[in-house]
């Protein structure tokens, strides 16, 4: 039995798929080295409200994304969101759940921004 | 172990086009773009532009554009940057860089360097 | 395109001195960012991808953080061996783009 989740494919997109001479969309093969682990990701940009995916496919090995089965943002408003997870084409879905800084309690608790998925 | 091997040092008249080879060893060659950096004397690097061996597909900077021309021999897993109507300012290092499969792309071997001088 | 800038262009230090380079992007480029060492007459080595994971045989003193537009390159205990010119380099979108360097000298 794996003590991981090994990730042997992901969605592949790119939004800027005519200049960078690529495909545009489809499944990407993560091949490596054994020694090495492979993930998938997901870069997204939020323009008004409007979520515009920007690249998927297999990212280098990346400790950021160990034992992540879910594509999760979690900094606050980024300019540019990033996920990344182990596990076959597991970056088909993308969420943003931002991490709260823990500051004072307050009286009113803060909610936490709603998600975006894919 | 992976190597790049690039060809030796050329001295050009301005106006006149040079072309640089790779020769990449130890890898599938089609399997990983190579890209073209330069290095004036003296000075930082300067993105060129990259092929896929695999496709022949290219890439260049807007800066290159007419005068480059990038492509590749996958027999003998050779890749090769022409640069033509050479100017002084032209005189650099130029370098092949194989990058790695996956994303964030980073370029992960190195040729050791071809000197380009351009001078009348 | 976008810029990369670098800071400092230059700095001196002495072995076993923590040396902080940083890389500030024109505009967001997430963690598609590497860090290169290269020393004179040489080809430039890789250092670190993806903002902060270290390449394959480079030592742990090594190491890199940020996201978005500012980054960090820091040397923890600067060896002789690591006196050099360190880039930083961008491949989120094209044009590829590198800062302009620093070159970190003996005090």
């Known amino acids: 039995i794996l003590g991981r989740s090994e990730t042997q494919e992901c969605l592949f997109f790119n939004a800027n798929w005519e200049k960078d001479r690529t495909n545009q969309t489809g499944v990407e093969p993560c091949y490596g080295d054994k020694d090495k682990r492979r993930h998938c990701f997901a870069t997204w940009k939020n323009i008004s409200g409007s979520i515009e995916i920007v690249k998927q496919g297999c990212w280098l090995d990346d400790i950021n994304c160990y034992d992540r089965t879910d594509c999760v943002e979690k900094k606050d408003s980024p300019e540019v969101y990033f996920c990344c997870c182990e596990g076959n084409m597991c970056n088909e879905k993308f969420s943003y759940f931002p991490e709260m800084e823990v500051t004072q309690p307050t009286s009113n608790p803060v909610t936490p921004k709603p998600p975006y998925y894919n | 172990q992976v190597q790049l091997v690039q060809s030796g040092a050329e001295v050009k008249k301005p106006g006149a086009s040079v072309k640089v080879s790779c020769k990449a060893s130890?890898?599938?060659?089609?399997?990983?773009?190579m890209h073209w950096v330069r290095q004036a004397p003296g000075q930082g690097l300067e993105w060129m532009g990259w092929?896929?061996?695999?496709?022949?597909?290219?890439n260049y900077a807007q800066k290159f554009q007419g005068r480059v021309t990038m492509t590749r021999d996958t027999s003998i897993s050779t890749a090769y940057m022409e640069l033509s109507r050479l100017r002084s300012d032209d005189t650099a290092v130029y370098y092949c860089?194989?990058?790695?499969?996956?994303?964030?792309?980073?370029?992960?071997?190195w040729g050791q360097g071809t000197t380009v001088t351009v001078s009348s | 395109d976008i810029q990369m800038t670098q800071s400092p262009s230059s700095v001196s230090a002495s072995v076993g001195d923590r040396v902080t380079i940083t890389c500030r992007a024109s505009?967001?480029?997430?963690?598609?960012l590497a860090w290169y060492q290269q020393k004179p007459g040489k080809a430039p080595k890789l250092l670190i991808y993806?903002?902060?994971s270290l390449q394959s045989g480079v030592p742990s003193r090594f190491s890199g953080s940020g996201s978005g537009t500012d980054f960090t390159l820091t040397i923890s205990s600067l060896q002789p061996e690591d006196f050099a010119t360190y880039y930083c380099?961008?491949?989120?979108?094209?044009?590829?783009?590198f800062g302009g360097g620093t070159k970190v000298e003996i005090k």
């Open positions: 380099q961008q491949a989120f979108s094209h044009p590829w783009t």
């Open positions: 092929i896929n061996p695999a496709s022949g597909w290219t």
């Open positions: 993806a903002a902060s």
């Open positions: 130890g890898y599938t060659f089609t399997g990983h773009k």
């Open positions: 860089a194989r990058v790695s499969m996956y994303a964030p792309e980073p370029m992960d071997v």
């Open positions: 505009q967001g480029i997430s963690r598609w």
